[in-house]
Amino acid sequence: EKLPKAPVITTPLETVDALVEEVATFMCAVESYPQPEISWTRNKILIKLFDTRYSIRENGQLLTILSVEDSDDGIYCCIANNGVGGAVESCGALQVKMKPKITRPPINVKIIEGLKAVLPCTTMGNPKPSVSWIKGDNALRENSRIAVLESGSLRIHNVQKEDAGQYRCVAKNSLGTAYSKLVKLEVEVFARILRAPESHNVTFGSFVTLRCTAIGIPVPTISWIENGNAVSSGSIQESVKDRVIDSRLQLFITKPGLYTCIATNKHGEKFSTAKAAATVSIAEWSKSQKDSQGYCAQYRGEVCDAVLAKDALVFFNTSYRDPEDAQELLIHTAWNELKAVSPLCRPAAEALLCNHLFQECSPGVVPTPMPICREYCLAVKELFCAKEWQAMEGKAHRGLYRSGMHLLPVPECSKLPSMHRDPTACTRLPYLDYKKENITTFPSITSSRPSADIPNLPASTSSFAVSPAYSMT
């Protein structure tokens, strides 16, 4: 009669390389008496005998994965036990090899000149594929503006008209190569005023021609506003040449007025607008003298009516030709961008933009605006609108307006005063009085595990994007 013998694994498990959808086998040869029970684990979790993805044969000594998936990566162990001595174990790794696969291919993009475009190209494969890009028929070279990111996506900073064209990404590893379909990058250009109308001081009953020239892709349209309303009299002549539109408004002057040229073009569902104003005054008419830097007045606009404190005095910057009109246009343009952002970000961003463009004002000998407290700005930037912030900054720093006005609706947090310096010298935003049940998501940057009263759902992915390519990376 045979003597009992504790199990000994005579063939230790080794690392197995396998391609996706192929068969992978681990062998665990065991000598023992009586015959052992052999169990198998993957990443310390028992593989069930009835799991149809596996085949266990030769009294358990052979484990076969019938069709390898990329999720099968891991450490496999066999454990042999026959009741004599202790159980013995041998472990080996399964490395799933995979030909390159493009899991998120690039898509057609319309992007505005000067912004940042990101063409996605997310890949899978083992070994990790290298990603390169082709524009037209040539390999794309990286430079200070154009970079292939770690993720494989193509990032183009400060997009230029010459970046327009057809692109495809190429994923390559030792097992093969995958190509994406060709996608088109179209570059659009914000409406921009090349020549602003000039102000005139004329005698009663004179004729004046105001001229306004604008450029953009697509070609902008030009409209004229008189004292905030559509022009009621006068004749308009227009001509278009090489994406430049030239508009001339001829007026018979019987009263002074502020005439505003508005150039607009469309980018997808959104519009970009540039605006320039000129005054027509009549000689010897008196006009109100306003402070050279700015003045305090009640907010009479619509966009920020629900955000700003009722009847509060706000600062109007007289470096604009028509401050109230100009600032309202700036906020109106920014407001349109906010329609795309997450519900968490929107009220915070609205409060930030309104309080930045219409700062609380202390009247006096020198009207003084009160900027937002730095800490509140940072909270909007890094907690409420982490994903959206950079996209908005990109647009803001481009300067959508010319003729003495450029759009900078986003404050630079680091330049704002801190609450520590003088708590009364800066504005605290009113956006934070969220009811707890309304807070459903925080960007992942806030904390790895938030407190019990704020659920930490996935971060918002919306952005102030003009197109899917214009996003934060």
Epitope: A379, E382, S418, P423, L432, T446, P450, D453
Partner: antibody, heavy 124, light 107 residues
Framework: EVQLVESGGGLVQPGGSLRLSCAAS????????IHWVRQAPGKGLEWVAS????????SYADSVKGRFTISADTSKNTAYLQMNSLRAEDTAVYYC?????????????????WGQGTLVTVSS | DIQMTQSPSSLSASVGDRVTITCRAS??????VAWYQQKPGKAPKLLIY???SLYSGVPSRFSGSRSGTDFTLTISSLQPEDFATYYC?????????FGQGTKVEIK
């Protein structure tokens, strides 16, 4: 002048309870956030709990969750830390500290004023 | 939870030396990082807030900076009163974590 004064520390047996108070002056607790931070003998600083009384929102470190409760009485301008089921490892100097603004911005302003601390000893 | 790994745990330096203390966050964090100085038997004092802003009344030889997940406190010229323990602190909405501390001793 901003001041925070803690009280209520002392010797307590394991399983026992204590209530720490943090009396504030020179600012209102309703417009700031109040935090409790502790320091075991010879060890580093450990955050315990925070409250933003204007919104009634609170937060706790995992090590005290379910045992400690932070609260504030704005009429008395005082914050409290109710400590139940005390353990030997809760022995420490407990500081209360404040930060400017509500819970969302307090992290950016830092803990700018601290009390002198009160010693809690949990021992049988 | 986010861990703040502070290094070194202690250092010896002389008056006039430039001293650098680093805190590395275990994952991406906001700039809600502060630095404190603590002397034996005393409460901590705020030096730097929002990663790089100098708290009022703190000497300008103290400065803070950020590079990705690394936060640095620099004392440009160590003074006798600077020998103490320094802590970094990170805030989420709310989850506050402190570094383990760095003891700055006289060489």
């Amino acid at each position: 002048e901003v001041q925070l004064v803690e009280s209520g520390g002392g010797l307590v047996q394991p399983g026992g309870s204590l209530r720490l108070s943090c009396a504030a002056s020179g600012f209102t607790v309703s417009s700031s956030s109040i935090h409790w931070v502790r320091q075991a003998p010879g060890k580093g600083l450990e955050w315990v709990a925070s409250i933003s009384s204007s919104y009634g929102s609170t937060s706790y470190a995992d090590s005290v969750k379910g045992r400690f409760t932070i609260s504030a009485d704005t009429s008395k301008n005082t914050a409290y830390l109710q400590m139940n089921s005390l353990r030997a490892e809760d022995t420490a100097v407990y500081y209360c500290a404040r930060s400017e603004g509500d819970r969302y911005v307090s992290g950016y302003s830092g803990l700018d004023y601290w009390g002198q601390g009160t010693l809690v000893t949990v021992s049988s | 939870d986010i861990q703040m790994t502070q290094s070194p745990s202690s250092l010896s330096a002389s008056v006039g030396d430039r001293v650098t203390i680093t805190c590395r966050a275990s994952q991406s964090v906001s700039s809600a990082v502060a630095w404190y100085q603590q002397k034996p038997g005393k409460a901590p004092k705020l030096l730097i807030y929002s990663a790089s802003s100098l708290y009022s009344g703190v000497p300008s030889r103290f400065s803070g900076s950020r590079s990705g997940t690394d936060f640095t406190l620099t004392i440009s010229s160590l003074q006798p009163e600077d020998f103490a323990t320094y802590y970094c602190q990170q805030s989420g909405v709310w989850l506050i974590t402190f570094g383990q501390g760095t003891k700055v001793e006289i060489k």
